[in-house]
């Protein structure tokens, strides 16, 4: 609710990797992971599976680097993209070495964000102007879910500042003074 | 919906200190950075400083470095600015902001009136 | 310091005026620039920054340019509710400065 009000405006995607936020369901190269481990089973999910969490979708590791202006971060950061339907998590594509891709003939279950985390990232300017960071919200988790005519794609939420642009979050660095806080930045403490 | 509300109007003799707090609802504080921005009567705007409420860092205008300290209690979600040493000149709405960078205010409080007088 | 100017302080303005406010910088500040508006017994809101790009929900009738020393925030088709002080504000260097604002009246 309240990062709906914080749009992102400048985010660079990594070209290798693809659009953003939703690389089709073939998209696979080694930057991408698939887990089962996250999401529920819908009710009436069409697979009478009583442990639900065999239910899951792809979670696709996505980088990026986070632009604004003239200024892009000083290192890319690493953020999931939730990609595909759900269904069991052992006919989802590499579960098991196989390639299939269970589709339910029912209601769509959509693989979502469910869990989102902000990581402060320092932004380098042209120019020696003064140093300025800002705090990216970042997909931590995915989610099945069953999307009705009410849902729309854009459930991810964001800090930003334009619309109609790719998410991303921002915020400044502190002043050089702070050595240790410019360290924790710099090695994606978060 | 992204809201800042601050505590009410004080009134302080010079060279005592007031504390203004600011509750942010819609979003963890700790995901973004807090400004403080003074306004004198009739006057323009006045930069005091940010924080990163997550790691306690502070960025101060030299104007105010050593009377000011910004906190947050992220618990709460609320943030606060400590002005010491108060002078008449110190008179003023004194705003919190906030945003996801340390150089843009996109919310701001409804502002809180600091009056110093003897 | 980054010393901002703007100017002017106030004007006067009907509705449906185009309306330009310059803001100008003691020094270079790239486009590092970011405009305000306040109304009166309010607290300001942000409505462009980094120069020209305009803030989700803003009207586009609201413009900014410039680059270097010389910044103009433009109002193509003055609306009543624009009836208030603008503020630029440089984010190059320490401290982050505001201009003394510009108060758009009405005629």
């Known amino acids: 609710q309240g990062w709906q009000a914080f749009k992102n405006d400048a985010t660079e995607i990594i070209p290798e990797l693809g659009e953003y936020p939703e690389p089709p369901p073939e998209l696979e190269n080694n930057k991408t992971m698939n887990r089962a481990e996250n999401g529920g089973r819908p009710p009436h999910h069409p697979f009478e599976t009583k442990d639900v969490s065999e239910y899951s979708c792809r979670e696709l590791h996505f980088t990026r680097y986070v632009t604004d202006g003239p200024c892009r971060s000083a290192k890319p950061v690493t953020e999931l993209v939730c990609s595909g339907q759900c269904g069991p998590a052992r006919l989802l594509p590499n579960a098991i070495g196989r390639g299939k891709w269970w589709r339910p003939s029912g209601p769509d279950f959509r693989c979502i964000p469910d869990r989102y985390r902000a990581q402060r990232v320092q932004l380098l300017c042209p120019g020696g102007e003064a140093p300025r960071a800002r705090k990216v919200r970042l997909v931590a988790s995915c989610k099945c879910k069953r999307l009705t005519r009410f849902h729309n794609q854009s459930e991810l939420k964001d800090f930003g500042t334009e619309a109609a642009r790719p998410q991303k979050g921002r915020k400044p660095r502190p002043r050089a003074r702070s050595a240790k806080a410019n360290q924790a930045e710099l090695e994606n403490a978060y | 919906q992204v809201q800042l509300v601050q505590s009410g109007a004080e009134v302080k003799k010079p060279g005592a200190s007031v504390k203004v707090s600011c509750k942010v609802s819609?979003?963890?504080?700790?995901?973004?950075?807090q400004h403080w921005v003074r306004q004198a009567p009739g006057k323009g705007l006045e930069w005091m400083g940010w924080?990163?409420?997550?790691?306690?860092?502070?960025e101060y205008a030299s104007k105010f470095q050593g009377r000011v300290t910004m906190t947050e209690d992220t618990s709460t979600d609320t943030a606060y600015m400590e002005l010491s040493s108060l002078r008449s000149e110190d008179t003023a709405v004194y705003y919190c902001?906030?945003?996801?960078?340390?150089?843009?205010?996109?919310?701001w409080g409804q502002g809180t009136t600091v009056t110093v007088s003897s | 310091d980054i010393q901002m100017t703007q100017s002017p302080s106030s004007l006067s303005a009907s509705v449906g005026d185009r309306v330009t406010i310059t803001c100008r910088a003691s020094?270079?500040?790239?486009?590092?620039l970011n405009w305000y508006q306040q109304k009166p017994g309010k607290a300001p809101k942000l409505l462009i920054y980094?120069?020209?790009r305009l803030l989700s929900g803003v009207p586009s009738r609201f413009s900014g340019s410039g680059s270097g020393t010389d910044f103009t925030l433009t109002i193509s088709s003055l609306q009543p509710e624009d009836f208030a002080t603008y503020y630029c504000?440089?984010?190059?260097?320490?401290?982050?400065?505001f201009g003394g604002g510009t108060k758009v009246e009405i005629k």
């Open positions: 924080s990163d409420p997550e790691i306690g860092d502070t």
């Open positions: 020094q270079d500040i790239s486009n590092y």
């Open positions: 504000q440089q984010y190059s260097d320490y401290p982050w400065t």
């Open positions: 980094y120069t020209s």
């Open positions: 819609g979003f963890p504080i700790k995901d973004t950075f």
């Open positions: 902001a906030t945003g996801d960078t340390t150089y843009k205010f996109d919310f």
